[in-house]
């Protein structure tokens, strides 16, 4: 029985050239987190593993920094970074929890944070 919920930063926007923190939070479960994956569409950005620590995909090494916590910081944003991002929590014994974040990278200075929402 999967009782946990993932809270994410939801729909967010940021300025081109700036940076943004993607964050997910798993709650309402006593399951142990064994690994967290961060993905952009079908591309793996980073992994944080309980035994191995962080691994940043080579193609993103210059623009992605881990943290804070299990979050991910995207730097030097381009309009091509617009899209869906997923945090995938691998847990024991519950299984996998997935959270979704939509990032829009704007040319102008009108970027504003969207509301938070929960994915059961």
């Amino acid at each position: 029985m999967m009782t946990g919920t993932i809270e994410t930063t939801g729909n967010i926007s940021a300025e081109k050239g700036g940076s943004i923190i993607l964050q997910c939070h798993l709650s309402s479960t006593t399951a142990q987190v064994t690994q967290v994956n961060w993905e952009q569409q079908d591309q793996l950005l980073a992994i944080c593993n309980a035994d191995l620590g962080w691994h940043i995909s080579p193609s993103f090494k210059d623009r992605v920094a881990p943290g804070p916590g299990l979050g991910l910081t995207l730097q030097s944003l381009t309009v091509n970074d617009t899209g869906e991002y997923f945090c995938i929590y691998h847990t024991y014994p519950d299984g996998t929890y997935t959270g979704r974040i939509f990032l829009e990278v704007l040319e102008s200075s009108v970027a504003e944070h969207g509301a938070r929402f929960q994915i059961p």
């Epitope: 939070h25 798993l26 006593t30 944080c48 593993n49 309980a50 620590g53 691994h55 920094a65 881990p66």
Partner: antibody
Framework: QVQLQQPGSELVRPGASVKLSCKAS????????MHWVRQRHGQGLEWIGN????????NYDEKFKNRGTLTVDTSSSTANMHLSSLTSEDSAVYYC??????????WGQGTTLTVSS | DIVLTQSPATLSVTPGDSVSLSCRAS??????LHWFQQKSHESPRLLIK???QSISGIPSRFSGSGSGTDFTLSINSLETEDFGMFFC?????????FGGGTKLEIK
Amino acid sequence: QVQLQQPGSELVRPGASVKLSCKASGYTFTSYWMHWVRQRHGQGLEWIGNIFPGSGTTNYDEKFKNRGTLTVDTSSSTANMHLSSLTSEDSAVYYCTREGLYPFDYWGQGTTLTVSS
Amino acid sequence: DIVLTQSPATLSVTPGDSVSLSCRASQNIRNNLHWFQQKSHESPRLLIKYASQSISGIPSRFSGSGSGTDFTLSINSLETEDFGMFFCQQSNSWPYTFGGGTKLEIK
């Protein structure tokens, strides 16, 4: 097994600088954040900053931004903290500690820094 | 910066008693709260991660609860080795911060 080795003590003069080291072993050094935390005598724990050895990314508490510099030598799996313009207020035990999936599962033994003339 | 306030500052108890230590955050930190024990002249030791998750090698008498801004570390049937300082710490955002600590002493 995971180990974070720190020198036992350092004695420096007021106004001088110090470089504290933390040698890591037993794990992949570039895959974990290294944090620095200090504790004045009989006081609480104070977060100084952190560095991700895989990229050199750093974060600092505002209090240490102008005086503290964190660096790593990945070839020797060593993290360093450089602290300048020292005063007696900087006398404390300085710990290094790592963070992966969660903080702070392993700690160094701490370096006792004494700032005195 | 997120401020963590621990209470009480000092707690005098007898071995065998059960206690609850409090940690309150100045803003919502979800479950990004961790508990540490520190004995005199020793490095801190991680007891509980993410508010309630157990750590391998830590006795089951230590447990954590809470989310958001209010957190509790509970110790059931205290043993003499349990006395010392207890700190909470948040990893929700940088700069990471610690609570001021609770000293658990033998009555």
